[in-house]
Amino acid sequence: GSSPRSGVLLRGCPTHCHCEPDGRMLLRVDCSDLGLSELPSNLSVFTSYLDLSMNNISQLLPNPLPSLRFLEELRLAGNALTYIPKGAFTGLYSLKVLMLQNNQLRHVPTEALQNLRSLQSLRLDANHISYVPPSCFSGLHSLRHLWLDDNALTEIPVQAFRSLSALQAMTLALNKIHHIPDYAFGNLSSLVVLHLHNNRIHSLGKKCFDGLHSLETLDLNYNNLDEFPTAIRTLSNLKELGFHSNNIRSIPEKAFVGNPSLITIHFYDNPIQFVGRSAFQHLPELRTLTLNGASQITEFPDLTGTANLESLTLTGAQISSLPQTVCNQLP
């Protein structure tokens, strides 16, 4: 049943919005898709969740949400924001999730983000961001998840990432990034998931992934790589690797030597002709291996230490005989 307090809470619900108690004597407020052009003014101080997405809000004034010290999630996605001023999020001491995707931002709102010390998740995807200032995330010490996909970035904002040592997942997909320099993610030792798919990446620094000691998922699909990404060799915890739909012609010997935890490798839609015989050795977690059209393969791959394959597909190769040990190597 509802307590007297929840009745008081619901009396602080803005017109046309949907409000409900969140179970902790705080209020969830949904004002999404109402055609609003400005923020509602009579918000309860006890609001913990505020959804203003899919409206027509084109600007935020400084300090537009005064006293919402319990607000943990603010959704402003799908509006018409081109700029967010300094002080827009002042006083939001509990804010953990900030959604600003599908707006028209051209820059990361550096000044507005300062001092959001509790922020854990920041969505800036599907904007027009072409530049990420060096210090723009410097106060976000709790940030765990960062979305920067579907923007207009042409390079990795290396300096901006240096302060994000707690970051666990990041996507930079669907941008126009062409190169990843050495140590691009050098301080992101907690990062587990990194999405770089659908860019224009044609070259990788030899040490571009150095420092990513926790990385488990790396997505390089749909890029312009023409060489195997040997920089992955420092990723000792990598479990899932994608580099399909690139222009890679060969997989070298000992290709995955530093990645013994790999479970999944997606590399279809590459013009792969050559595969080093030792390329897929010592991958005990690998379940599926598909090599189609690798016309320069003349010997069956050496699968020593890759003992748990459940599916092996080899087509278009020039293999004339199978080694006697092949049945011993596979389960």
Epitope: I156, P181, D182, G186, D210, T230, K254, V257
Partner: antibody, heavy 118, light 111 residues
């Protein structure tokens, strides 16, 4: 605790070769580059080359390229530096070090003195 | 090769006073906003010890009296209040491009 332990001192004649080892422990061996640096008596530090253990990824200082080979053995977590055609000016303490944050050398072996003398 | 030049070659400072060491690179060692410049301390008979990485970042466990600054070609290591245990030779190093190169070293002594 990260540790790099090097092999003992060597005395070699000019023209000979020397192989110095560096055994790593306390971290994931294949995830960090190992660098080799030398220091002649009373002199400064000179970078020789680097390897990513377990792989064939190596880089050498052009000055040493024809005489130096850096290899690794993942089964023992050991990196080796081999220097051939030794000359008296190769007399130095040879250090291995781990390439840490942004390639800075965050852990060092204790050093191996190689003396080249006829 | 990038040449690293330290100044001065040696430095005598009173206990508790500030010590400043400069390092100049023959060309910029900055890349994507990062300065690939590091500082080390070496005491007699010991291997070097990392103090500062990327020009200004204090390595874990290093006392905060050590600080680094600079960018592109000009860098500084500062010991704000010299202690007896700081007597050593200090080296700068770049790893912007190989061959990675070190400065010739600066010897810090107590006046």
């Amino acid at each position: 605790e990260v540790q790099l332990v090097q092999s003992g001192a060597e005395v070699k004649k000019p023209g000979a070769s020397v192989k110095v080892s560096c055994k790593a422990s306390g971290y994931t061996f294949s995830a960090y580059w190992i660098e080799w640096v030398r220091q002649a008596p009373g002199q400064g530090l000179e970078w020789i080359g680097e390897i990513l253990p377990g792989s064939d990824s190596t880089d050498y200082n052009e000055k040493f390229k024809v005489r130096v080979t850096i290899t690794s053995d993942t089964s023992t977590s050991t990196v080796y530096l081999e220097l051939s055609s030794l000359r008296s000016e190769d007399t130095a303490v040879y250090y291995c070090a781990r390439g840490g944050h942004y390639g800075s050398l965050d852990y060092w072996g204790q050093g191996t003195l190689v003396t080249v003398s006829s | 090769d990038i040449v690293m030049t330290q100044s001065p070659d040696s430095l005598a400072v009173s206990l508790g006073e500030r010590a400043t060491i400069n390092c100049r690179a023959s060309e910029s060692v900055d890349n994507y906003g990062n300065s690939f410049m590091h500082w080390y301390q070496q005491k007699p008979g010991q291997p070097p010890k990392l103090l500062i990485y990327l020009a200004s970042n204090l390595e874990s466990g290093v006392p905060d009296r050590f600080s680094g600054s600079g960018s592109r070609t000009d860098f500084t290591l500062t010991i704000s209040s010299l202690q007896a245990e700081d007597v050593a030779v200090y080296y700068c190093q770049q790893n912007y491009e190989d061959p990675f190169t070190f400065g010739q070293g600066t010897k810090v002594e107590i006046k």
